[in-house]
Each structure stands twice: as C-alpha cells, then as structure tokens.
C-alpha cells in the first residue's frame, strides 16, 4: 500500500491522543534503554510502511501484535485517513490476526513495540520538519 496520500496531520493527532498511550502501557515495566532502535524511516509514507509492517506482520519470535489495543487503533486510524487502505489491507491483516496462537508478551514482542515507538516518534519528527 502506498501511504503517500494519507492525511498525516490527522494520523499524528490520533497517535498523540490515544495510540501512544497504548504503546506505552504495553511497554510498562521496561526502560527505554532496554532495547536499541534498529528500524528507521526517512519520510512520512516510509514511516507508515514500516509501522504497518511491524504492527501487523508476524515475526518468528513475536507471532502477531495485531490483537493488541494499539494495533486495533492503528488499523482504525489508517482506515480513516488513508484513502483505499481498508480495501487493500484489512483482509490481509485480519488473516494475520487469525494466525496468532497465544497472548504472551515475550521479550521479542517488547522489543518490537519499542521499535514501533521509535518509528512513530520519527513519523512525528518528519511531520514537524515539513511544517
């Protein structure tokens, strides 16, 4: 999916108002220094591509984060503010959600959510630069 035509201001507002709080809640009990940020992004569409991938694509040690509250809110935000996102992405992410086995917050999942926080912060920084 090409995130170029998204309403970035609206996405930023949703992130700051609600998604960020759920990410931080998920990470509660860990320190920001516990994980190194290895994933980066260069512009707003690229940041959203990476956020989408890390949130909804299962990885070997973190089956899927798609059922978490921050993921549901991310999906809702992208559906609202990115034209055509629902039509091209929702069925794919629903299938990934079904693949999830058990709800265990592993260290690998914490690391993945830490990367997500970094990507979102980067998204907002690139937004500020453009204004």
């Amino acid at each position: 999916y090409d995130f170029t035509n998204c309403d970035f201001q609206k996405i930023e507002a949703d992130y700051l108002r609600t998604i960020s709080k759920d990410l931080i809640t998920y990470m509660s009990g860990t320190k920001s220094t516990d994980f190194n940020n290895t994933v980066s992004c260069s512009n707003r569409p690229h940041c959203l591509t990476e956020i989408q991938s890390l949130t909804f694509n299962p990885t070997p040690r973190c089956a899927s984060l798609a059922k978490e509250m921050f993921a549901r809110k991310t999906k809702a935000t992208l559906a609202l503010w990115c034209p055509g996102y629902s039509e091209t992405q929702i069925n794919a992410t629903q299938a990934m959600k079904k693949a999830r086995k058990s709800k265990v917050t592993t260290n690998k999942c914490l690391e993945q959510v830490s990367q997500l926080l970094g990507l979102w912060r980067r998204f907002i920084r690139t937004l500020l630069k453009k204004q």
């Epitope: 309403d7 609206k10 949703d14 108002r17 609600t18 998604i19 549901r72 809110k73 999906k75 809702a76 935000t77 559906a79 609202l80 503010w81 034209p83 055509g84 629902s86 039509e87 929702i90």
Partner: antibody, heavy 120, light 111 residues
Framework: QVQLVQSGAEVKKPGSSVKVSCKAS????????INWVRQAPGQGLEWLGV????????IYAEKFQGRVTITADTSTSTAYMELSSLRSEDTAVYYC?????????????WGQGTLVTVSS | QSALTQPPSASGSPGQSVTISCTGT?????????VSWYQQHPGKAPKLMIY???KRPSGVPDRFSGSKSGNTASLTVSGLQAEDEADYYC???????????FGGGTKLTVL
C-alpha cells in the same frame, strides 16, 4: 440481538437544541463507526457525521460543522447527536447507523429513527 | 459537495430487470470503490443492499447486483418481485472525509 435503539420523538422551538441518543447492543460498540443520517419529510437521506469510539474520532459534514456535536459513552454503548440553533428545515427523522468495522462508510445496521419536529 | 444524481423513478414488471443509475464525480464515485446502495420501504429505516460497489451483505438476494464505470454507479434488480417496490438510495464516500454522500433517491415501482 444486534440492534440500535434510539430515543423518542421530540418537539422543539426554533433556536433551541435537541439531543438524540442511540443505544447499541449485541456487538462491540467501540470498534464500529456510529453515523448519523437524517431524512426530512418526503425527502432523501443526508449524512450529518460519524464517531469512531475506538480512536475518539468525530467527522462532521461541512454543512453541519459548528451546529452538530456527536459524542459516545463506551461504558453504556450509547452514541449521542446534538443539533443546535434549530430551524424549521431541521424537521426530519434522524437515524443512527452503524458503519462497518474499518469500513465506517457502509451503514449495515440502522436505528428505528427519531422524529424531530421544529415548530414555534 | 452536491448530492449524487439518480433518476426520480424507475419501473418494471414482475420477473423483469431494472437498472438504477447514480452519477457523481471523480471526487466521489470515480475516486473511490466505496459505493453503497440502500433500500427503504415507506415508514421504515433504510437497509444496506450493496457495499464496496458490488458486494452483497448476507441475507440480500443475489437478484441485486452493483457495478461502477467511471463516475457512474448502477444497481440492477433482476427477476423483479412485488416486495422490491421501494425507494433506493446510492451513497459514496467523498473526498474531504465525507462518509455518506447520498443520491436523491429513486422510487422503484413494480407494475
């Protein structure tokens, strides 16, 4: 069962406000959009706005911006639509309608409608 | 945005097919595959018949079908039955985050 139940008919004076409620049951209220649509007597359908409780987003039709307020109480699975500065042209049946999860612009479940009459 | 354009009336005999058109612009119908159709019987709430241009919700007979070409969407009702007599409204998502840009409605009469 899966349904939207709206509050009863209202008669209002021009210049006043009206608040219509819409109680959801049988589905996860927060995940869907709750849209508001009105229909004046003998006329077509007109979209007023939507709320998506999951992310706390409200979007209003340009025509009603500043005059309509849509809110939701997730603890009671109830959405509200308040329309202010009423005029006779606002006389209509007001419907709440569920927007599909992540496809909030398809209205797959409707309330029974609330008749709002604006008359002096 | 101005409302989508529908013919005020359409008619057909039982068993026949009838097509209702809905014309918009590149900012609504032409720009998104987010067209839906609603059936409304007198004194009742509307009912979703078609969404996503051509998808049918469960419970809607396959006699109802939808399509789109450019800025115009169409609803076809084949094998007309008496209970199909109702008002039909098209709706489209429109730029500027308008979730329900409706047509003026078409009164379908089964002769």
């Amino acid at each position: 069962q899966v349904q939207l139940v709206q509050s009863g008919a209202e008669v209002k004076k021009p210049g006043s406000s009206v608040k219509v409620s819409c109680k959801a049951s049988g589905f996860t209220f927060g995940s869907y959009g709750i849209n508001w649509v009105r229909q004046a007597p003998g006329q077509g359908l007109e979209w007023l706005g939507v709320i998506v409780p999951l992310v706390g987003v409200t979007i209003y039709a340009e025509k009603f911006q500043g005059r309509v307020t849509i809110t939701a109480d997730t603890s009671t699975s109830t959405a509200y639509m308040e329309l202010s500065s009423l005029r006779s042209e606002d006389t209509a049946v007001y419907y709440c309608a569920r927007g599909q999860e992540y496809f909030y612009w398809y209205f797959d479940l409707w309330g029974q409608g609330t008749l709002v009459t604006v008359s002096s | 945005q101005s409302a989508l354009t529908q013919p005020p009336s359409a008619s057909g005999s039982p068993g026949q097919s009838v097509t209702i058109s809905c014309t918009g612009t590149s900012s609504d119908i032409g720009g998104y595959d987010r067209v839906s159709w609603y059936q409304q019987h007198p004194g009742k709430a509307p009912k979703l018949m078609i969404y996503g241009v051509s998808k049918r919700p469960s419970g809607v007979p396959d006699r109802f079908s939808g399509s789109k070409s450019g800025n115009t969407a169409s609803l076809t009702v084949s094998g007309l039955q008496a209970e199909d007599e109702a008002d039909y409204y098209c709706s489209s998502y429109a730029s500027g985050h308008t979730f329900g840009l409706f047509g003026g409605g078409t009164k379908l009469t089964v002769l």
